[in-house]
Interface confidence: low
């Protein structure tokens, strides 16, 4: 902004400047120029002298002690020397004049003191008017601007020295400039006085609810130029979380309810993600609605989600003691895609309907591909015991399971196992043989399950006899056999569902009889 110290165009009466010489040089006139009455000074020395030396001095211009630099703006008209009759103008015709100044702490009255004036510039017209312009009544005004720097006294005078130009000094304005109070980059900069030269760096103050950028450019700064212009903005303020730049860019306004702004890198307030809300203005995060959560590591920009419902349509298919469990994904995934499944196995006494006691399955039960963190809705189970009762529980979980008070989303199925796989692939093995007994064992049977009513039936035969024997364990001691005799043995399992198939026939031979020492005479 400009602070005017003197402006002749606003003068309501005569200016009364000092003229030297008092006559035949500069003279004050009131003229209508382009429709406006103005008090101006003219000098058009036509007397044909080579050494025209006309001076005009302003009144004392009070500067105060504020501005060390003032600006002068002249509006003037210079007549083209060629426009005079004859085309050459008077002898010594010039088209320039000189601007000078003198500092003083007080008004020195009517003493001109020419030697104390310092020249500022030679003022030249970039356009001069011709006879044609005079006839048409349109006078071209030239504007000259210059600056007076490093002023130290309380006031100054301007002087105009005319060495021979035909000139009209239409207006003279003396002013200094301040960089006005302004807003830039959400920062307020105070009204600032420029320095005597160069730029003055000024720190800005962030507007309410704004703070300086953490970037290298940092706190907002601007530079006040000698011409009163703010230049080279560096850095800026950003609305703090919960606020955004208003439409005019001159304030930070609170995010409306239902929206949020989490950090200064986000340009605007964002609508709350699904299943979340911001009740009040100025939210930095939207809180999840009841029953909805964000998983650890999910930022405020992510929609809130819920735990899944239970898996559906849990079914199984068994083959021997192998089992395949299948199910369908939950009807409600909670709005997430990271649903995982966990399978728990319990072995029970009695059927599920009996409600007998259950305990976790032993280490021999194996799940493929695993029992936890399953991404596909199926699992294979190996290592189950025949004729045992099992309950399988399948639970659906996602990234927000367990964050609230909701129960487990699971479904169960109870299964009574049937026959084991055929014993045809299993082998009877001889543990020990003697002349009259054989000790045998067979592979493939697992530790007996609680409550399972299983026995094994052995079929033993040789050329002379056939016998059947029941045992509870997968081993047997056959006694009262013939020495050095081959026996054919096979085994099968007897279950509540009936007998299983026999194993293949195995041949075992007892040891020869132990020879007793011969006694003499016999």
């Amino acid at each position: 902004k400009e602070v005017t110290l003197m402006d002749t165009s606003k003068a309501q009466g005569e200016l009364g400047w000092l003229l030297d010489p008092p006559k035949d040089g500069w003279s004050e006139q009131q003229q209508i120029l382009n429709g406006t009455p103005l008090y101006m000074y003219q000098d058009c020395p036509m007397q044909g002298r080579r050494d025209t030396d006309h001076w005009l001095r302003s009144n004392w211009i009070y500067r105060g002690e504020e501005a060390s630099r003032v600006h002068v703006e002249l509006q003037f008209t210079v007549r083209d020397c060629k426009s005079f009759p004859g085309g050459a103008g008077p002898l010594g015709c010039k088209e320039t004049f000189n601007l000078l100044y003198m500092e003083s702490d007080q008004d020195v009255g009517i003493q001109l003191r020419r030697p104390l004036f310092q020249k500022v510039t030679t003022v030249a017209a970039d356009q001069s008017f011709t006879i044609r312009d005079l006839v048409s009544g349109s006078v071209k005004l030239n504007v000259e601007r210059c600056s007076l720097g490093r002023l130290t006294r309380r006031g100054l005078y301007l002087a105009f020295h005319n060495p021979g130009a035909c000139v009209a000094l239409v207006s003279v304005r003396v002013f200094y400039q301040r960089c006005p109070e302004t807003l830039n980059g959400l920062a307020q900069f105070p009204d600032t006085l420029p320095g005597p030269a160069g730029l003055v760096e000024v720190a800005g103050t962030c507007l309410p609810h704004a703070r300086a950028s953490p970037r290298p450019s940092g706190a907002p700064r601007m530079h006040c130029s000698p011409d009163g212009e703010w230049l080279v903005p560096v850095g800026r303020c950003h609305c703090e979380p919960g606020y955004e730049e208003g439409g005019s860019g001159e304030a930070c306004v609170a995010c409306p309810s239902g929206s949020y702004r989490m950090d200064m890198d986000t340009p605007h307030c964002l609508t709350c993600p699904q299943q979340s809300t911001a009740e009040s203005e100025g939210a930095t995060i939207c809180t999840c609605e009841s029953g909805h959560y964000r998983a650890p590591g999910e930022g405020p920009q992510v929609a809130c989600t819920g735990p899944p419902s239970a898996p559906r349509n849990l079914s199984f298919s068994a083959s021997g003691t192998q089992l395949s469990l299948r199910w369908e994904p939950p009807a409600d995934t909670g709005g997430r895609q990271d649903v995982r499944y966990s399978v728990r196995c319990s072995q029970c006494q009695g059927t599920a309907q009996d409600g007998g006691p259950c305990q976790p399955c032993g280490v021999g039960v194996h799940f493929s591909p695993g029992a936890r963190g399953l991404t596909t809705p199926a699992v294979h189970v190996n290592g189950l015991e025949p004729y045992a009762n099992y309950t399988f529980n399948v639970e659906a979980q996602n990234g927000v399971s367990g964050l609230g008070s909701s129960g487990h989303a699971s479904t169960s199925v109870s299964i009574s196992m049937g026959h084991a796989e055929s014993l045809s692939g299993l082998s009877l093995r001889l543990v020990k043989k003697e002349p009259r007994q054989l000790e045998l064992t067979w592979a493939g049977s697992r530790p007996r399950s609680p409550g399972a009513n299983l026995t094994y039936e052995l079929h033993v035969l040789n050329q002379d006899e056939e016998r059947y024997q029941m045992v509870l364990e997968p081993r047997v001691l056959l006694t009262e056999l013939q020495p050095d005799t081959t026996y054919i043995v096979r085994v099968r399992m007897l279950t509540p569902l009936g007998p299983g198939p026999f194993s293949p026939d195995h041949e075992f031979r007892t040891s020869p009889p132990v020879s007793r020492g011969l006694t003499g005479g016999e």
């Epitope: 609508t271 920009q301 992510v302």
Partner: antibody, heavy 121, light 106 residues
Framework: QVQLLQSGAEVKKPGASVKVPCKAS????????MSWVRQAPGQGLEWMGW????????TYAQGFTGRFVFSLDTSVSTAYLQISSLKAEDTAVYYC??????????????WGQGTLVTVSS | EIVLTQSPATLSVSPGERATLSCRAS??????PAWYQQKPGQAPRLLIY???TRATGIPDRFSASGSGTDFTLTISRVEPEDFAVYYC????????FGQGTKVEIK
């Protein structure tokens, strides 16, 4: 790397509809808005609008309201442009482009390869 | 709606020469436009956005300047791969593109 993959060319009859998918990969789909840009044969670029991939809220440029619908399926990181009641003048290449928002100015920093939609009877 | 007018429509330059593309806004705009490059049969590519920031992978021979209503994209030394159509784009409540300047081999 960051990619926007659009479907192949479509030939449709006037009055029909077309749905152009734009599948994003290599970045968090919901972290950036998606713009749609039209380029008629031999012509310049026309901004059609954009969709906020977080809220699904679309913004349509002048001249692209009514028959043009932007939509999303965030579960498959895909934005869609549906044009109904197709006209011959809808024949153009349609681009999806990821928006880069900054405090100082915006631009579209990743573009799909474009889908040519030809409307002809 | 702000209209962007690009000139010239076609600019013929030789490789190694300087190319200056103009983009004029129908009214003063508060920020510099973004600039894009498009080669035949390809999608546009972002060159410059924001405060004359080059996009990732854009060589430093591309620069932008201007303010108010007059903006310029300068290619300091045109390389063979720079022959393409260039678009300026302003942002605000609605985005608009200029009609494009084709840079062709002289």
């Amino acid at each position: 790397q960051v990619q926007l993959l659009q479907s192949g060319a479509e030939v449709k009859k006037p009055g029909a509809s077309v749905k152009v998918p734009c599948k994003a990969s290599g970045y968090t789909f919901t972290s950036r808005a998606m713009s749609w840009v039209r380029q008629a044969p031999g012509q310049g670029l026309e901004w059609m609008g954009w969709i906020n991939t977080n809220t699904g809220n679309p913004t349509y440029a002048q001249g692209f309201t009514g028959r043009f619908v932007f939509s999303l399926d965030t579960s498959v990181s895909t934005a869609y442009l549906q044009i109904s009641s197709l006209k011959a003048e809808d024949t153009a290449v349609y681009y999806c482009a990821r928006v880069r928002l900054t405090v100082y100015g915006d631009g579209m920093d990743v573009w799909g390869q474009g889908t040519l939609v030809t409307v002809s009877s | 709606e702000i209209v962007l007018t690009q000139s010239p429509a076609t600019l013929s330059v030789s490789p190694g020469e300087r190319a200056t593309l103009s983009c004029r806004a129908s009214q003063s705009v508060s920020s510099n436009p973004a600039w894009y490059q498009q080669k035949p049969g390809q999608a546009p590519r972002l060159l410059i956005y924001g405060l004359s920031t080059r996009a990732t992978g854009i060589p430093d021979r591309f620069s932008a300047s201007g303010s108010g209503t007059d903006f310029t994209l300068t290619i300091s030394r045109v390389e063979p791969e720079d022959f393409a159509v260039y678009y300026c784009q302003q942002y605000g409540p609605s985005w608009t593109f200029g009609q494009g300047t084709k840079v062709e081999i002289k």
